[in-house]
């Protein structure tokens, strides 16, 4: 029989920015191949996605996900019920809203079937990792000569997000940023009707009911000025 | 583009160490997704996987059973290379060696050493 | 181990000819079963990986397929270059990784 020995190699410590435990294992080996790190992400609190890097397996290995709510009503454990897929490995978990509670703490379990004991545990905020859907419906208003007001709106909870939104003139190489608050509304005191204006807005959850990091996407981009003016001096949709 | 250099001796006494080593370029020997991996040739045994190295937060190697007692895969990052040592080598080492890179998630072999013909002979 | 048996161990064929190789697995491997040819002088060269994808670069006349544990290496129409030795391999259950004893593709 042509069995194989694993033998770990190297005294590097790691430390990770979120709670991880490893099972000791009982095998011949000094120590157990680490697993890899799950990152979750709660898309606009309709549904969440904790993926892991499954190249990171030296042999292909469908990992399993279970998950529970710390010290709350939801402390069951539960069962991934919706595997995500890459090269037909389990490189993923997609929950619905139902199964998400922003407020409690997450801990999710990924765990190696071929070797039980090889497991690791990640506490998790949801609050924090929280990110919205773009910005939608993008309208400016002239409220003077020269004064021009951006809206927009967004799929959530208005208070609970912060925005940045750029703008730049086909006369700039870069974007010009102004932070705004839950108000979704900026106004550009000092226009050049002489140039053409694009304005693009991102959303975060941020800071009054989580503290994300990760900001949306950028919202299709709204145009105004020389080529656009003549149509409407007053109110422009939105250009994709 | 990822290309693995393979060098050293091609004829070793009886007895002695066999000593290879496998330079890479175009990806690092840290890589977390890559395992490299030392496989030899010869008529009587076909192609042979020995054995591999890779960096998971911390270094592993695994060994074939078969040379387990004789063999050490080593990785250097300070020269982005990895080596193969076979101690106390009889003729029937003399093979081709070579390296090669797999990575998930398919896990294959893309990238090969050129192989380097290694007699044991006196 | 995973073992894996390639029959046949060589085949004659002529230029033009449709040439099938298989490969089976001493237990099922999924689709992780990956085929190479090798010219002498020359390191394995990676044609089908996952049991059926062709390699980027890797004529069409190549296929390959099955799943669990009996495998096809089918050339359609043999080319002169193709004359060669092939060989499979599982990345399934690893270490060891492990490969077929290779078949040898010669000019009849």
């Known amino acids: 029989l042509n069995t194989t020995i694993l033998t770990p190699n190297g005294n590097e410590d790691t430390t990770a920015d979120f709670f991880l435990t490893t099972m000791p294992t009982d095998s011949l080996s000094v120590s157990t191949l680490p697993l890899p790190e799950v990152q979750c992400f709660v898309f606009n609190v309709e549904y969440m996605n904790c993926t892991w890097n499954s190249s990171s397996e030296p042999q292909p290995t469908n990992l399993t996900l279970h998950y529970w709510y710390k010290n709350s009503d939801n402390d069951k454990v539960q069962k991934c019920s919706h595997y995500l897929f890459s090269e037909e490995i389990t490189s993923g978990c997609q929950l619905q809203k139902k199964e998400i509670h922003l407020y409690q703490t997450f801990v999710v379990q990924l765990q190696d079937p071929r070797e039980p004991r090889r497991q690791a545990t990640q506490m998790l905020k949801l609050q924090n990792l929280v990110i919205p859907w773009a910005p939608e419906n993008l309208t400016l208003h002239k409220l003077s000569e020269s004064q021009l007001e951006l809206n927009w709106n967004n799929r959530f909870l208005n208070h609970c997000l912060e925005h940045l939104v750029q703008y730049r003139t086909d006369w700039d190489h870069s974007w010009t940023e102004q932070s705004v608050d839950y108000r979704h509304k900026f106004s550009l005191p000092s226009v050049d009707g002489q140039k053409r204006y694009t304005f693009r807005v991102r959303s975060r959850f941020n800071p009054l009911c989580g503290s994300a990091q990760h900001w949306s996407e950028w919202s299709h981009p709204i145009h105004w000025g020389s080529n656009t003016s003549k149509e409407n001096p007053f109110l422009f949709a939105l250009e994709a | 583009q990822v290309q693995l250099q393979q060098s050293g001796p091609g004829l070793v006494k009886p007895s002695q160490t066999l000593s290879l080593t496998c330079d890479i370029s175009?990806?690092?020997?840290?890589?977390?997704?890559?395992?490299w991996n030392w496989i030899r040739q010869s008529p009587s045994r076909g192609l042979e996987w020995l054995g591999r190295?890779?960096?998971?937060?911390?270094?592993?190697?695994d060994y074939a059973v078969s040379v387990k007692s004789r063999i050490t895969i080593n990785p250097d990052t300070s020269k982005n290379q990895f080596s193969l040592q076979v101690n106390s080598v009889t003729p029937e080492d003399t093979a081709v060696y070579y390296c090669a890179r797999m990575t998930g998630p398919r896990y294959y072999f893309e990238y090969w050493g050129q192989g380097t013909l290694v007699t044991v002979s006196s | 181990d995973i073992q894996m048996t390639q029959s046949p161990s060589s085949l004659s064929a002529s230029v033009g000819d449709r040439v099938t190789i298989t490969c089976r697995a001493s237990q099922s491997i999924s689709s992780y079963l990956n085929w190479y040819q090798q010219k002498p002088g020359k390191a394995p060269k990676l044609l089908i990986y996952a049991a059926s994808s062709l390699q980027s670069g890797v004529p069409s006349r190549f296929s390959g397929s099955g799943s669990g544990t009996d495998f096809t290496l089918t050339i359609s129409s043999l080319q002169p270059e193709d004359f060669a030795t092939y060989y499979c391999q599982q990345s399934y259950s690893t270490p060891p990784i492990t490969f077929g004893q290779g078949t040898r593709l010669e000019i009849k």
């Open positions: 175009g990806d690092s020997v840290s890589s977390n997704i890559a395992t």
């Open positions: 190295t890779y960096y998971r937060s911390k270094w592993y190697k």
